[in-house]
């Protein structure tokens, strides 16, 4: 095929691939008709002047996972047809000025996973057709004003996993076509007002895993097309009331792992496309009326691992579509009888690991489709008569680790449990805490020498347990999570992050290596 170097493979489709540690320089002669060249996993340390001079038809050039640390400014001379250039996963610390000069057709430039210390406006000033620029995984500490001013056609910019401590409000001002901006895993402490104002076509903004403490009230007001906003694992302590008010297209919002103490009514919305909201691992202490009222299409709401001690009766107003609600691992002692009344389509509620002492008899009155209720590890001594009677679809009920008081008042509950044992699972059964003479005995088989009143019992569903809600312990003792951990649903165990030390959350819950492009 017009001469293929011995250390390479050349295909009929004008594709050349050169790999192997024995390669220490760009192989020659390369086929003049090559359109795609890959140089991977070699020991090449530098690119000298014009090593690709005779393959001017080249469209894609990948020089990845090498020992490359030095490039001569004229290395890519005569590659005017080149559309894709990747220098990712090398050891570049410095880019020579003019390196990309003459690459008039270049659309994708990948410089990720190197050791770049700085970029300058002159680096990309010739790349007027560039659509994608990947700079993640370098050592950049700041981006100078003007660095991207000539990249007016850019649609995707990744600056994640660098060491950026601040961003100039002018650095993105000319990127009106940008659709994806990733700044995750840096050291940003704040984002100046106006930083994103020019990004009118932005669809994804990734700011997770920084040290952002405050959000300016109008930070996202020009980003009406934003669909995905990642703010998790920062230090955000409060949300300005209007910060999310003009994001009608938003369908992903992550705020977990921050320091939020309160949520003001109507803070979210209107966001008609948002179906899941993850707020776990914050410091929220109460939920006021109508706090989620704009989220009419929300299906999954995760509020676990906060410090919630009070939920206003109207806190969940408007959540008519909600299927799963996670409130586990909070500080709830009491719940208003009407708090879940509007959640007519709720299937799964997790309330475990709270301090609930009692439940109102009507707490689940309007939530007829409930399939799973997690109440383990609370302070419950008894439950009101008939609290579960109308829940014909209930197939998982967790009641263990509560201080059940096994006197005669427990009989109605005991009888119901006796007839509904499959719903309790096989792992852990509720046991008596008092009186002392029956402590530790199973609540289901305890012998209370009192006449047993008849109790209305609904028919147990033919499926004793649905797989959305399996019998996994929801508060395991282990301190690490494996990728095979069974997690019941985002409500119960997707967010039952008790298997992960808090110190691990930064790496486990971000996009880290997975967000490579």
């Amino acid at each position: 095929y017009h001469g293929c170097p011995s250390e390479c493979t050349c295909s009929r489709a004008s594709q050349v691939e050169c790999t192997g540690a024995r390669i220490v320089a760009v192989p020659t002669p390369l086929p003049w008709n090559a359109m795609s060249l890959q140089i991977l996993n070699t020991h090449i340390t530098e690119l000298n002047e014009s090593p690709f001079l005779n393959i001017s038809a080249l469209i894609a050039l990948r020089i990845e996972k090498n020992e490359l640390s030095r490039i001569t400014p004229g290395a890519f001379r005569n590659l005017g047809s080149l559309r894709y250039l990747s220098l990712a996963n090398n050891k570049l610390q410095v880019l020579p000025i003019g390196l990309f000069q003459g690459l008039d057709s270049l659309e994708s430039l990948l410089l990720s996973s190197n050791q770049l210390l700085q970029i300058q406006p002159a680096h990309f000033s010739q790349c007027s057709n560039l659509k994608e620029l990947q700079l993640h995984g370098n050592h950049l500490e700041y981006i100078p004003d003007g660095a991207f001013d000539h990249l007016v056609g850019l649609t995707k910019l990744n600056l994640g996993k660098n060491s950026l401590t601040h961003i100039s409000p002018r650095v993105f001002q000319h990127l009106g076509n940008l659709q994806v901006l990733r700044l995750y895993e840096n050291r940003l402490t704040d984002i100046p007002m106006g930083t994103f104002d020019g990004l009118v076509n932005l669809q994804e903004l990734a700011l997770q895993q920084n040290q952002i403490g405050l959000l300016s009230p109008g930070l996202f007001h020009n980003n009406h097309n934003l669909q995905r906003l990642y703010l998790s694992n920062n230090h955000i302590s409060q949300l300005p009331p209007s910060v999310f008010m003009q994001l009608p297209q938003l369908n992903r919002l992550t705020l977990f792992g921050n320091s939020l103490k309160e949520l003001s009514p109507g803070i979210f919305g209107p966001m008609p496309n948002l179906r899941e909201l993850w707020l776990y691992d914050n410091h929220i202490s109460s939920l006021p009326d109508n706090v989620f009222s704009n989220l009419r299409q929300l299906q999954v709401l995760i509020l676990s691992r906060n410090q919630i001690s009070f939920i206003s009766p109207g806190a969940f107003n408007g959540l008519t579509e909600l299927r799963e609600l996670s409130l586990h691992t909070n500080a709830l002692q009491d719940l208003d009888g009407n708090v879940f009344r509007m959640l007519a389509n709720l299937q799964n509620i997790s309330l475990q690991n709270n301090r609930l002492r009692q439940l109102p008899g009507n707490i689940f009155a309007n939530v007829n489709g409930l399939m799973a209720i997690q109440l383990q590890n609370n302070q419950l001594e008894n439950l009101p008569l008939g609290i579960f009677d109308h829940l014909g679809k209930l197939c998982e009920l967790r009641l263990y680790d509560n201080p059940w008081r096994c006197d005669s008042d427990i009989l109605p509950l005991r009888n119901w449990l006796l007839l509904n044992q499959p719903r309790l699972g096989t792992d852990t059964v509720p046991v008596c805490f008092s009186p002392a003479n029956v402590r530790g005995q199973s609540l289901i088989i305890i012998n209370v020498n009192v006449a047993v009143p008849s109790v209305h019992v609904p028919e147990v569903p033919s499926y004793p347990e649905t797989p959305w809600y399996p019998d996994t312990p929801s508060y395991p003792d282990t301190t690490s999570v494996s990728s095979t951990t069974e997690l019941t649903s985002p409500v119960e165990d997707y967010t039952d992050l008790t298997t992960i030390q808090v110190t691990d959350d930064r790496s486990v819950w971000g996009m880290t290596q997975a967000q490579s492009g």
Partner: antibody, heavy 119, light 110 residues
């Protein structure tokens, strides 16, 4: 563009295990759900379960609990399904599929992996 | 589990004519604003392809001759003017509970 590329066909002996891979690209792997679906020869579709790569969290169809194990490797943006104690009725095409939210439809599918269990 | 019953099992329609496929659920899969029913097309040797999500929302890139309707337990997929490339098996799927699929409807040209 979203792509799910599955591993090649497998022929296995009864009682053995098989691990099917699903390499994802074109989207932020950790942020979406990966489903697995079975299609026996000449039959319809059967949902096996899903995995949420953020934490490797899983939900299973009760029928496949103990039979299938779903895992992910976020560093390679790959989802895996391992089937154990294989029997002839496990002979099928297995698909991975992408979903935006837990209750959403499966909008992108892998090409399928044929697993044949035969002695 | 929710059982989805598709009818008919197979359907022969002339080119340019309307094709209608029904799917009945053993219980309601709808709320006041959403129906958790989706429709897929599968051609021989290929994976399923999403056509309609949430009962009536046309997936991006799908021709507008495909439409979905219904709520509660009864749903319909309609191909307004059958084209040769529409020959396939069509499946409904519910995501209200544990996901289940209908048995499929084979669409052929008469």
């Amino acid at each position: 563009e979203v792509q799910l590329v599955q591993s090649g066909a497998e022929v296995k002996k009864p009682g053995s295990s098989v691990k099917v891979s699903c390499k994802a690209s074109g989207f932020t792997f950790t942020d979406y759900y990966i489903h697995w679906v079975k299609q026996a020869p000449g039959q319809g579709l059967e949902w096996i379960g899903l995995v949420y790569p953020y934490i490797g969290g899983t939900n299973y169809n009760q029928k496949f609990k103990g039979k299938a194990t779903l895992t992910v490797d976020t560093s390679t943006t790959t989802a895996y399904m391992e089937m154990s104690s294989l029997r002839s009725e496990d002979t099928a095409v297995y698909y991975c599929a992408h979903g935006d939210n837990k209750y959403d439809a499966m909008d992108y599918w892998g090409q399928g992996t044929t697993v044949t269990v035969s002695s | 589990d929710i059982v989805l019953t598709q009818s008919p099992d197979s359907l022969a329609v002339s080119l340019g004519e309307r094709a209608t496929i029904n799917c009945r659920a053993s219980q309601s899969v709808s709320t006041s604003s959403y129906s958790y029913m989706h429709w897929y097309q599968q051609k021989p040797g290929q994976p399923p392809k999403l056509l309609i999500k949430y009962a009536s929302s046309l997936e991006s890139g799908v021709p507008d001759r495909f439409s979905g309707s219904g709520s509660g337990t009864d749903f319909t997929l309609t191909i307004s003017s059958l084209q040769a490339e529409d020959v396939a098996v069509y499946y409904c799927e519910q995501s209200w509970e544990i996901r289940t699929f209908g048995g499929g409807t084979k669409v052929e040209i008469k």
